[in-house]
């Protein structure tokens, strides 16, 4: 009897959909695996007789519930199927956006770039998929614990009237208000402000 794959799960970030599993202990030799997806009531092979413990399902429709399954094989024997269901638009993790930060005197000018999507044109981003897409920005004075959050209305934001000659850190994430779903924070970007632009009288 061939044991089934273990810990079968979908790892999906920005619609890069990777079905992952672990190979069970099996004394007779090395196992191979076959992974399939349900299409119009028929299961179709996606990865056949692979020695890998993952299979790329990024070409699935972003919409709807998909049934995926994987089994282990050895010679002419095979395990039972292990099934999971997956809805990309609901289940994919929103990866961190890109961010460009520029210091201008006592202000930080930020521009945000929505995450790109697997198997899509360069210009079709997560912002195109989710109509309610917005950004959350948090910033803080480097070395302090107090964080401030803002929700920019556009793909850019300016933090004004900051303390001169002070290092501020900023990070951004995608947020979907209609789903109350937040993405992953970007890595903090820390920049030092320069002089206060006000001219002494």
């Amino acid at each position: 009897m061939v044991p089934p794959p273990e810990n079968v799960r979908m790892n999906s970030v920005n619609f890069k959909n990777i079905l992952q599993w672990e190979s069970p202990a099996f004394a007779k030799g090395n196992l191979t695996f076959t992974a399939q997806y349900l299409s119009y009531r028929i299961f179709q092979d996606k990865c056949m007789n692979t020695t890998l413990t993952e299979c790329d399902f990024s070409s699935l429709s972003k919409y709807g519930d998909h049934t995926l399954r994987v089994r282990a094989e050895f010679a002419d024997e095979h395990s039972d199927w292990v099934n999971i269901t997956f809805c990309p638009v609901d289940d994919t993790i929103i990866g961190p956006p890109g961010m460009q930060v520029e210091v201008l005197a006592d202000s930080l000018h930020m521009r945000f770039l929505a995450p790109k999507i697997e198997n899509e044109y360069e210009t079709w981003t997560m912002k195109n998929v989710y109509n309610s897409w917005t950004y959350n920005v948090q910033y803080w004075k480097n070395g302090t614990d107090e964080k401030f959050q803002i929700t920019p209305q556009y793909d850019f934001e300016v933090l004004r009237n900051l303390e001169p000659w002070t290092t501020y850190c900023v990070q951004v994430r995608g947020f979907l208000p209609d789903r109350n779903k937040a993405g992953e924070w970007s890595e903090p970007v820390c920049e030092q402000t320069t002089h206060d632009e006000t001219v002494p009288s």
């Epitope: 070409s59 699935l60 429709s61 972003k62 919409y63 638009v89 198997n119 899509e120 044109y121 210009t123 079709w124 195109n128 998929v129 109509n131």
Partner: nanobody, 124 residues
Framework: EVQLVESGGGLVQPGGSLRLSCAAS????????IGWFRQAPGKGLEGVSC????????HYADSVKGRFTISRDNSKNTLYLQMNSLRAEDTAVYYC?????????????????WGQGTQVTVSS
């Protein structure tokens, strides 16, 4: 059932131009995303371009960027693909497709309705 009908294909010399059209028979082309795909002889289906109804944004495959232009005329319920500076590698059957959910642009899995295709041949 929605029927998409393409037209405008034909034989053209390298460097020439063609304009493809796609109309929905008896229906409007009022879909969140509509796009063009192509299939060259012996190859798989390839995304060419799409247009999003929500913001009118247009998106292109790298291989056609700067040469092809997608547009729609809502008054005529027609989608167009203006193809300039055509090359031999653009030879393919071109398909129009429409998506009900509008979540994707390039992947054929994200489209629900398809036309029968129109042949484009670029040859001297």
């Amino acid at each position: 059932e929605v029927q998409l009908v393409e037209s405008g294909g034909g034989l053209v010399q390298p460097g020439g131009s063609l304009r493809l059209s796609c109309a929905a028979s008896g229906n409007s082309l009022d879909y969140p995303t509509i796009g063009w795909f192509r299939q060259a002889p012996g190859k798989g289906l390839e995304g060419v371009s799409c247009i999003s109804a929500s913001d009118g944004s247009t998106h292109y495959a790298d291989s056609v960027k700067g040469r092809f232009t997608i547009s729609r005329d809502n008054s005529k319920n027609t989608l167009y693909l203006q193809m300039n500076s055509l090359r031999a590698e653009d030879t393919a059957v071109y398909y129009c497709a429409a998506s009900l959910h509008g979540l994707g642009c390039k992947s054929e899995a994200d489209y629900d309705y398809w036309g029968q295709g129109t042949q484009v041949t670029v040859s001297s």
